[in-house]
Protein backbone atom coordinates (compact mmCIF):
# COMPACT_ATOMS: atom_id res chain seq x y z
CA UNK A 1 0.00 0.00 0.00
CA UNK A 2 2.48 2.52 0.98
CA UNK A 3 4.22 4.09 -1.91
CA UNK A 4 8.07 4.05 -2.11
CA UNK A 5 10.36 7.23 -3.27
CA UNK A 6 13.94 6.53 -3.80
CA UNK A 7 16.18 9.49 -4.12
CA UNK A 8 20.24 9.92 -3.57
CA UNK A 9 21.97 10.26 -0.37
CA UNK A 10 24.48 13.20 -1.78
CA UNK A 11 24.32 15.64 -4.21
CA UNK A 12 27.26 18.79 -4.66
CA UNK A 13 26.14 21.53 -6.07
CA UNK A 14 28.16 22.82 -8.97
CA UNK A 15 30.18 26.34 -8.86
CA UNK A 16 27.20 27.91 -10.55
CA UNK A 17 24.96 27.04 -7.11
CA UNK A 18 22.50 24.31 -9.16
CA UNK A 19 21.86 21.09 -8.05
CA UNK A 20 20.36 18.14 -9.82
CA UNK A 21 18.82 14.80 -8.60
CA UNK A 22 16.62 12.04 -9.58
CA UNK A 23 13.55 11.19 -8.07
CA UNK A 24 11.98 8.25 -8.65
CA UNK A 25 8.81 6.76 -7.27
CA UNK A 26 7.23 3.11 -7.19
CA UNK A 27 3.92 3.85 -8.38
CA UNK A 28 0.78 1.27 -6.48
CA UNK A 29 -1.05 2.34 -9.21
CA UNK A 30 -1.29 4.36 -12.94
CA UNK A 31 -1.36 7.67 -11.86
CA UNK A 32 -2.34 10.59 -14.25
CA UNK A 33 -1.75 13.69 -12.05
CA UNK A 34 0.89 13.96 -9.90
CA UNK A 35 1.93 16.40 -7.64
CA UNK A 36 6.01 17.04 -6.68
CA UNK A 37 7.05 18.90 -3.96
CA UNK A 38 10.89 19.57 -2.79
CA UNK A 39 11.07 19.87 0.88
CA UNK A 40 13.91 21.33 2.80
CA UNK A 41 14.65 19.97 6.31
CA UNK A 42 16.56 22.24 8.48
CA UNK A 43 16.54 21.77 12.56
CA UNK A 44 13.71 19.83 12.56
CA UNK A 45 11.68 22.38 10.33
CA UNK A 46 10.43 21.96 7.20
CA UNK A 47 9.89 24.37 4.49
CA UNK A 48 8.71 23.87 0.98
CA UNK A 49 11.25 24.85 -1.70
CA UNK A 50 9.64 24.57 -4.87
CA UNK A 51 5.88 22.70 -6.40
CA UNK A 52 4.48 21.09 -9.06
CA UNK A 53 1.37 19.14 -10.48
CA UNK A 54 1.95 17.50 -13.98
CA UNK A 55 -0.39 15.27 -16.01
CA UNK A 56 2.26 12.08 -16.49
CA UNK A 57 3.58 12.47 -19.91
CA UNK A 58 3.76 15.84 -20.03
CA UNK A 59 6.00 18.55 -18.37
CA UNK A 60 6.65 19.71 -14.98
CA UNK A 61 5.25 23.16 -14.39
CA UNK A 62 7.19 25.27 -11.43
CA UNK A 63 5.56 28.79 -10.74
CA UNK A 64 7.42 31.34 -12.65
CA UNK A 65 9.60 32.85 -9.89
CA UNK A 66 10.52 28.92 -8.79
CA UNK A 67 13.56 27.93 -7.95
CA UNK A 68 13.32 24.45 -9.63
CA UNK A 69 13.09 23.14 -12.97
CA UNK A 70 12.58 20.03 -13.88
CA UNK A 71 11.22 16.93 -15.88
CA UNK A 72 9.28 13.77 -15.96
CA UNK A 73 10.21 10.62 -17.64
CA UNK A 74 7.84 7.59 -16.59
CA UNK A 75 7.55 7.06 -12.82
CA UNK A 76 11.29 9.58 -13.04
CA UNK A 77 11.44 12.97 -11.79
CA UNK A 78 14.83 15.08 -12.73
CA UNK A 79 14.67 17.98 -10.65
CA UNK A 80 17.12 20.87 -11.04
CA UNK A 81 17.24 23.66 -7.81
CA UNK A 82 18.81 26.73 -9.02
CA UNK A 83 20.61 30.17 -7.42
CA UNK A 84 22.03 27.98 -4.46
CA UNK A 85 24.46 29.33 -1.57
CA UNK A 86 26.64 27.62 1.28
CA UNK A 87 23.42 28.79 3.24
CA UNK A 88 21.16 26.28 1.24
CA UNK A 89 23.37 23.53 2.31
CA UNK A 90 21.17 21.02 4.11
CA UNK A 91 18.53 17.89 3.56
CA UNK A 92 16.47 18.44 0.51
CA UNK A 93 13.20 15.88 0.38
CA UNK A 94 11.09 14.79 -2.52
CA UNK A 95 7.27 14.21 -2.06
CA UNK A 96 5.15 12.84 -4.08
CA UNK A 97 1.49 12.47 -4.31
CA UNK A 98 -0.86 10.65 -6.41
CA UNK A 99 -3.71 12.95 -6.89
CA UNK A 100 -5.68 11.01 -9.66
CA UNK A 101 -7.58 8.76 -9.98
CA UNK A 102 -7.90 7.34 -6.84
CA UNK A 103 -6.78 6.14 -4.72
CA UNK A 104 -4.24 9.08 -3.48
CA UNK A 105 -1.26 7.78 -2.61
CA UNK A 106 1.72 10.14 -0.71
CA UNK A 107 5.35 9.05 -0.94
CA UNK A 108 8.38 10.71 1.02
CA UNK A 109 12.40 10.10 0.41
CA UNK A 110 14.45 9.74 2.83
CA UNK A 111 16.52 13.05 1.58
CA UNK A 112 19.38 14.54 -0.51
CA UNK A 113 21.68 16.32 1.54
CA UNK A 114 23.26 18.96 -1.28
CA UNK A 115 25.93 20.32 -0.48
CA UNK A 116 26.85 24.02 -1.23
CA UNK A 117 30.01 25.81 -1.48
CA UNK A 118 30.48 29.30 -2.35
CA UNK A 119 32.74 30.29 -5.31
CA UNK A 120 35.85 32.01 -4.23
CA UNK A 121 35.76 35.38 -5.45
CA UNK A 122 38.46 36.00 -8.53
CA UNK A 123 41.73 38.01 -7.27
CA UNK A 124 42.26 41.28 -9.03
CA UNK A 125 44.07 41.09 -12.61
CA UNK A 126 46.19 43.17 -14.28
CA UNK A 127 45.38 41.32 -17.30
CA UNK B 1 0.57 31.96 13.97
CA UNK B 2 -1.94 29.37 12.04
CA UNK B 3 -5.50 29.25 12.69
CA UNK B 4 -8.59 27.09 11.52
CA UNK B 5 -11.70 28.22 12.94
CA UNK B 6 -15.10 26.47 12.04
CA UNK B 7 -18.69 27.55 11.45
CA UNK B 8 -21.77 26.36 10.42
CA UNK B 9 -22.76 23.89 12.50
CA UNK B 10 -26.24 23.56 14.62
CA UNK B 11 -29.25 21.37 14.92
CA UNK B 12 -30.71 19.99 11.65
CA UNK B 13 -33.48 17.86 10.84
CA UNK B 14 -33.19 14.38 9.23
CA UNK B 15 -33.10 14.87 5.58
CA UNK B 16 -31.60 18.78 5.55
CA UNK B 17 -28.68 20.34 4.65
CA UNK B 18 -26.33 22.47 6.15
CA UNK B 19 -22.62 24.27 4.97
CA UNK B 20 -20.04 24.40 7.10
CA UNK B 21 -17.16 26.47 7.03
CA UNK B 22 -13.74 26.58 7.86
CA UNK B 23 -11.53 29.84 7.72
CA UNK B 24 -7.90 29.60 7.45
CA UNK B 25 -4.92 32.30 8.56
CA UNK B 26 -1.17 32.27 9.60
CA UNK B 27 -0.03 30.30 6.49
CA UNK B 28 -0.47 30.05 2.29
CA UNK B 29 -3.57 28.00 2.20
CA UNK B 30 -3.06 27.28 -1.42
CA UNK B 31 0.21 25.33 -0.62
CA UNK B 32 -1.79 22.92 1.74
CA UNK B 33 -4.06 20.59 0.79
CA UNK B 34 -6.92 19.99 3.82
CA UNK B 35 -9.29 17.87 4.99
CA UNK B 36 -12.32 17.41 7.09
CA UNK B 37 -12.67 14.83 10.56
CA UNK B 38 -15.84 14.26 12.57
CA UNK B 39 -16.15 12.74 15.91
CA UNK B 40 -19.80 11.45 17.10
CA UNK B 41 -20.43 12.31 20.87
CA UNK B 42 -18.07 9.58 22.87
CA UNK B 43 -16.84 8.20 19.55
CA UNK B 44 -13.65 8.57 17.68
CA UNK B 45 -12.02 10.38 14.87
CA UNK B 46 -13.05 9.49 11.90
CA UNK B 47 -11.76 10.97 8.96
CA UNK B 48 -14.32 12.38 6.48
CA UNK B 49 -13.12 14.19 3.12
CA UNK B 50 -10.46 15.54 1.50
CA UNK B 51 -9.71 18.27 -1.31
CA UNK B 52 -6.23 19.17 -3.61
CA UNK B 53 -4.26 22.27 -3.49
CA UNK B 54 -6.25 23.78 -6.26
CA UNK B 55 -9.58 22.23 -5.12
CA UNK B 56 -9.51 19.42 -8.57
CA UNK B 57 -9.51 16.35 -6.78
CA UNK B 58 -11.44 15.22 -3.54
CA UNK B 59 -11.67 12.19 -1.87
CA UNK B 60 -14.35 10.93 0.67
CA UNK B 61 -15.58 8.23 3.27
CA UNK B 62 -18.29 5.87 1.64
CA UNK B 63 -20.56 7.19 4.66
CA UNK B 64 -20.52 10.27 3.03
CA UNK B 65 -20.14 9.71 -0.63
CA UNK B 66 -22.91 11.08 -2.45
CA UNK B 67 -24.08 13.26 0.39
CA UNK B 68 -21.32 15.45 1.14
CA UNK B 69 -19.25 17.81 -0.66
CA UNK B 70 -16.04 19.75 -0.10
CA UNK B 71 -14.67 22.88 -1.68
CA UNK B 72 -12.30 25.74 -1.47
CA UNK B 73 -11.83 29.50 -2.01
CA UNK B 74 -8.21 30.05 -2.29
CA UNK B 75 -8.63 33.87 -2.27
CA UNK B 76 -10.80 33.88 0.41
CA UNK B 77 -8.51 31.00 2.23
CA UNK B 78 -11.82 29.10 3.11
CA UNK B 79 -12.90 25.38 2.75
CA UNK B 80 -16.51 24.34 3.06
CA UNK B 81 -18.49 20.53 3.16
CA UNK B 82 -21.68 21.39 2.36
CA UNK B 83 -23.78 18.25 3.89
CA UNK B 84 -26.91 17.29 2.15
CA UNK B 85 -29.60 14.54 3.05
CA UNK B 86 -28.16 14.60 6.69
CA UNK B 87 -28.89 11.37 8.70
CA UNK B 88 -29.07 11.01 12.54
CA UNK B 89 -25.30 9.31 12.23
CA UNK B 90 -23.97 12.41 11.10
CA UNK B 91 -24.25 13.94 14.59
CA UNK B 92 -20.52 14.63 15.03
CA UNK B 93 -17.90 17.43 16.25
CA UNK B 94 -16.35 18.30 12.77
CA UNK B 95 -13.15 19.07 12.59
CA UNK B 96 -11.18 20.89 9.37
CA UNK B 97 -7.57 19.78 9.53
CA UNK B 98 -4.33 21.26 7.68
CA UNK B 99 -2.35 18.30 6.08
CA UNK B 100 1.64 18.87 7.02
CA UNK B 101 4.28 18.79 4.49
CA UNK B 102 5.36 14.93 5.57
CA UNK B 103 1.57 13.82 5.99
CA UNK B 104 0.14 14.22 8.97
CA UNK B 105 -2.53 16.41 10.52
CA UNK B 106 -0.74 19.01 12.25
CA UNK B 107 -3.44 21.69 12.97
CA UNK B 108 -6.76 21.30 13.82
CA UNK B 109 -10.11 23.80 13.95
CA UNK B 110 -11.43 23.97 17.43
CA UNK B 111 -14.31 21.94 15.80
CA UNK B 112 -18.29 22.74 15.16
CA UNK B 113 -21.06 21.04 16.57
CA UNK B 114 -23.69 19.22 14.20
CA UNK B 115 -26.78 17.75 15.46
CA UNK B 116 -29.02 16.19 13.12
CA UNK B 117 -32.63 15.07 15.38
CA UNK B 118 -36.08 15.98 14.82
CA UNK C 1 -9.07 0.43 3.37
CA UNK C 2 -5.83 -0.37 6.31
CA UNK C 3 -7.58 -1.01 9.36
CA UNK C 4 -5.93 0.28 12.24
CA UNK C 5 -6.12 -1.56 15.75
CA UNK C 6 -5.23 0.25 19.29
CA UNK C 7 -4.54 -2.11 22.57
CA UNK C 8 -5.61 -2.03 24.76
CA UNK C 9 -8.61 0.19 24.23
CA UNK C 10 -8.13 2.05 27.90
CA UNK C 11 -5.84 1.72 30.52
CA UNK C 12 -5.48 2.68 34.42
CA UNK C 13 -1.86 4.11 34.99
CA UNK C 14 -0.36 6.46 37.67
CA UNK C 15 1.90 9.87 37.36
CA UNK C 16 5.44 8.77 36.63
CA UNK C 17 4.50 5.10 35.35
CA UNK C 18 5.63 3.96 32.19
CA UNK C 19 2.83 3.49 29.22
CA UNK C 20 3.05 1.88 26.33
CA UNK C 21 0.46 1.61 23.57
CA UNK C 22 0.00 -0.67 20.19
CA UNK C 23 -1.31 0.12 16.68
CA UNK C 24 -2.02 -2.60 14.63
CA UNK C 25 -2.43 -2.14 11.08
CA UNK C 26 -4.81 -4.68 8.92
CA UNK C 27 -1.69 -4.23 5.73
CA UNK C 28 1.80 -2.95 5.60
CA UNK C 29 2.31 0.73 6.63
CA UNK C 30 5.37 2.22 5.71
CA UNK C 31 6.77 3.82 8.72
CA UNK C 32 7.02 7.51 7.02
CA UNK C 33 3.31 7.49 7.20
CA UNK C 34 2.06 6.38 10.77
CA UNK C 35 1.04 9.20 13.04
CA UNK C 36 0.00 9.90 16.91
CA UNK C 37 -2.48 12.10 17.94
CA UNK C 38 -3.75 12.73 21.75
CA UNK C 39 -7.30 14.59 22.62
CA UNK C 40 -8.21 15.92 25.87
CA UNK C 41 -11.61 16.39 27.23
CA UNK C 42 -13.44 19.25 24.85
CA UNK C 43 -10.27 20.06 22.94
CA UNK C 44 -9.25 19.31 19.55
CA UNK C 45 -6.66 16.55 18.71
CA UNK C 46 -3.13 17.87 18.78
CA UNK C 47 -0.43 16.07 16.62
CA UNK C 48 2.45 14.17 18.86
CA UNK C 49 4.29 11.96 16.58
CA UNK C 50 4.45 11.55 12.56
CA UNK C 51 6.80 9.56 10.52
CA UNK C 52 6.34 6.75 13.40
CA UNK C 53 9.08 8.39 15.08
CA UNK C 54 9.34 12.05 15.24
CA UNK C 55 8.03 14.44 17.79
CA UNK C 56 6.08 17.12 16.62
CA UNK C 57 6.79 20.62 17.55
CA UNK C 58 6.71 21.22 21.31
CA UNK C 59 6.04 17.74 21.67
CA UNK C 60 7.91 16.56 25.10
CA UNK C 61 10.92 13.92 24.99
CA UNK C 62 9.04 11.67 27.09
CA UNK C 63 6.79 10.85 24.19
CA UNK C 64 8.42 8.44 21.69
CA UNK C 65 7.59 6.39 18.78
CA UNK C 66 8.78 3.25 17.12
CA UNK C 67 7.85 0.24 14.98
CA UNK C 68 7.37 -0.49 11.11
CA UNK C 69 5.55 -2.59 8.76
CA UNK C 70 2.13 -3.34 10.70
CA UNK C 71 3.10 -2.89 14.11
CA UNK C 72 3.63 0.78 15.58
CA UNK C 73 4.35 1.56 19.72
CA UNK C 74 3.97 5.23 21.11
CA UNK C 75 5.86 4.96 24.53
CA UNK C 76 5.34 7.18 27.32
CA UNK C 77 8.52 6.98 29.51
CA UNK C 78 7.37 8.57 32.84
CA UNK C 79 3.41 9.44 32.64
CA UNK C 80 2.40 13.20 33.53
CA UNK C 81 -0.98 14.26 34.94
CA UNK C 82 -1.61 16.53 31.96
CA UNK C 83 -0.65 13.40 29.77
CA UNK C 84 -4.43 11.74 30.82
CA UNK C 85 -6.12 11.54 27.62
CA UNK C 86 -7.27 9.75 24.73
CA UNK C 87 -4.51 8.58 22.10
CA UNK C 88 -5.57 7.75 18.27
CA UNK C 89 -2.61 6.29 15.59
CA UNK C 90 -3.44 7.16 12.06
CA UNK C 91 -1.99 6.10 8.90
CA UNK C 92 -1.76 8.87 6.38
CA UNK C 93 -0.03 7.40 3.25
CA UNK C 94 -3.06 6.13 1.31
CA UNK C 95 -6.70 7.30 0.78
CA UNK C 96 -9.11 6.50 2.58
CA UNK C 97 -7.18 8.36 5.70
CA UNK C 98 -7.89 5.80 8.82
CA UNK C 99 -7.61 6.07 12.73
CA UNK C 100 -7.10 3.47 15.38
CA UNK C 101 -10.61 3.35 17.58
CA UNK C 102 -8.31 5.29 20.37
CA UNK C 103 -6.81 4.78 23.83
CA UNK C 104 -8.18 6.11 27.03
CA UNK C 105 -5.67 6.32 29.60
CA UNK C 106 -7.50 7.32 32.89
CA UNK C 107 -5.65 7.96 36.22
CA UNK C 108 -5.42 5.21 38.56
Known amino acids: KAMHVAQPAVVLANSRGTASFVCEYASPGKATEVRVTVLRQADSQVTEVCAATYMMGNELTFLDDSICTGTSSGNQVNLTIQGLRAMDTGLYICKVELMYPPPYYMGIGNGTQIYVIDPEPCPDSDF | EVQLVESGGGLVQPGGSLRLSCAAS????????MHWVRQAPGKGLEWVSF????????YYADSVKGRFTISRDNSKNTLYLQMNSLRAEDTAVYYC???????????WGQGTLVTVSS | AIQLTQSPSSLSASVGDRVTITCRAS???????LAWYLQKPGQSPQLLIY???SRATGIPARFSGSGSGTEFTLTISSLQSEDFAVYYC?????????FGQGTKVEIK
Open chain 2, 97 to 107: ARTGWLGPFDY
Open chain 3, 51 to 53: GAF
Open chain 3, 90 to 98: QQDGSSPWT
Open chain 2, 26 to 33: GFTFSHYT
Open chain 2, 51 to 58: ISYDGNNK
Open chain 3, 27 to 33: QYVGSSY
